[in-house]
């Protein structure tokens, strides 16, 4: 069965069929009929119940709210309610690019090493029974492939394979023709053998701070795709409500490696935050590397040689 829509924030392209499936779809346990409701709220409108009165484009099933198709004005928050279970999603419907066979904001990027196995399979399990045909395009030019139900590319990658591959599923519903597009941006890179990950900057950093203020400790590393970067502090991570790990940022280098940075934000600095180690570690199969930060009160700066400070 198709998995439920667990992502709370969803972006879709106008004009395509779309569905939300709630995550309390335990079909085996439901014996008696259960009253269920779907609601939408957006801007001025608070919790409007969804049925064909609110939009003739929607259809309701046991676990699924379908849009035939989804349109720009469907942007908003959606709620499913059943007994004491509620699930919420934020839906953002974006404009279709009329000048291309795909919309740039709805592209999945994939990196493939040259000479390694490269595969694209056009599948859509939810709408499978309604799909008449499927076409695969490369840079918006149709590829002539044998199978027009599930077109597939399977080969060893070459640099010429780089490009935008779009799977377009054509389906009929209530006498109308719809299409669903899924696009992959395939980048072919040189053979990438793993590097030993390394944290950038000095191994020990004293950071001058003032009590009551905030500080952001930035930890950056050069690492492999599967390597991890994390912060360790105090006796038990997360025990201090003033300490927050921000979302990790990753940028790919031209060599196919990753530059990652993770910020530790300490708000309303107190005495307990001073003179303790905040350790940032990068870990890989090949080992670990750690750097440390110590917060020092600005008044105590004179006691430490100038070259060990970071700002």
């Amino acid at each position: 069965a198709e998995s439920c829509t667990s992502r709370p924030h969803i972006t879709v392209v106008e004009g395509e069929p779309f569905y939300l499936k709630h995550c309390s779809c335990s079909l085996a346990h439901e014996i008696e009929t259960t009253t269920k409701s779907w609601y939408k709220s957006s801007g001025s409108q608070e919790h409007v119940e969804l049925n064909p009165r609110s939009s003739s484009r929607i259809a309701l099933h046991d676990c699924v709210l379908e849009f035939w198709p989804v349109e720009l004005n469907d942007t908003g928050s959606y709620f499913f309610q059943m007994k004491n279970y509620t699930q919420k999603w934020k839906l953002n419907v974006i404009r279709r690019n009329k000048h291309s066979c795909f919309t740039e904001r709805q592209v999945t990027s994939k990196i493939v090493e040259v000479k390694k196995f490269f595969q694209i399979t056009c599948e859509n399990s939810y709408y499978q029974t309604l799909v008449n045909s499927t076409s695969l395009y490369k840079n918006c030019k149709k590829l002539l492939l044998e199978n027009n139900k599930n077109p597939t590319i399977k080969k060893n990658a070459e640099f010429e394979d780089q490009g935008y591959y779009s799977c377009v599923h054509f389906l009929h519903h209530n006498g109308k023709l719809f299409n669903i597009t899924k696009t992959f941006n395939i980048t072919i890179v040189e053979d990438r053998s793993n590097i030993v990950p390394v944290l950038l900057g000095p191994k020990l950093n004293h950071v001058a701070v003032e009590l009551g203020k905030n500080v952001r400790l930035n930890c950056s590393a050069l690492l492999n795709e599967e390597d991890v970067i994390y912060w360790m502090f105090g006796e038990e991570n997360g025990s201090d409500p003033n300490i927050h790990e921000e979302k990790e940022m990753r940028i790919m280098t031209p060599e196919g490696k990753w530059h990652a940075s993770k910020v530790l934000r300490i708000e309303n600095i107190g005495e307990s935050n001073l003179n303790v180690l905040y350790n940032c570690t990068v870990a890989s199969t090949g080992g670990t590397d750690t750097k440390s930060f110590i917060l020092v009160r600005k008044a105590d700066m004179a006691d430490i040689p100038g070259h060990v400070f970071t700002r």
Partner: nanobody
Framework: DVQLQESGGGLVQAGGSLRLSCAAS????????INWFRQAPGKERARAWD??????????YYADSVKGRFTVSRDHAKNTVYLQMNSLKPEDTAFYYC??????????????WGKGTLVTVSS
């Protein structure tokens, strides 16, 4: 011959109850969601259902105007769907139609329609 047949309509006083039935012949009702639509006197048939039950019978959906008063159920063995209507109001007076479709959806998407049964609620 494929058809849907509603029954159970009639005259009832405000606050009273009625149970409508929707029986299928020539096809299996269990393969479809059953939607109940109404057509008030002198008006077009509504494009949106008042109540709907999915093909599995696990889920029921109701319009705000009938929520808490109407209950939809189905008996797979009898190939029949029921609409139990309680606390009826004069504004519920209408022809009631059952329709079979792939989902609880707009009138234009339904595959089969019944001929309707009249419910009259007097004050």
């Amino acid at each position: 011959d494929v058809q849907l047949q509603e029954s159970g309509g009639g005259l009832v006083q405000a606050g009273g109850s009625l149970r409508l039935s929707c029986a299928a012949s020539g096809f299996t009702l269990g393969a479809y969601a059953i939607n109940w639509f109404r057509q008030a006197p002198g008006k077009e048939r509504a494009r949106a259902w008042d109540a709907c039950i999915t093909s599995s019978g696990r889920s029921a959906y109701y319009a705000d105007s009938v929520k808490g008063r109407f209950t939809v159920s189905r008996d797979h063995a009898k190939n029949t769907v029921y609409l139990q209507m309680n606390s009826l109001k004069p504004e519920d007076t209408a022809f009631y139609y059952c329709a079979a479709g792939a989902a609880c959806a707009a009138a234009g998407t339904m595959n089969y329609w019944g001929k309707g049964t009249l419910v009259t609620v007097s004050s």
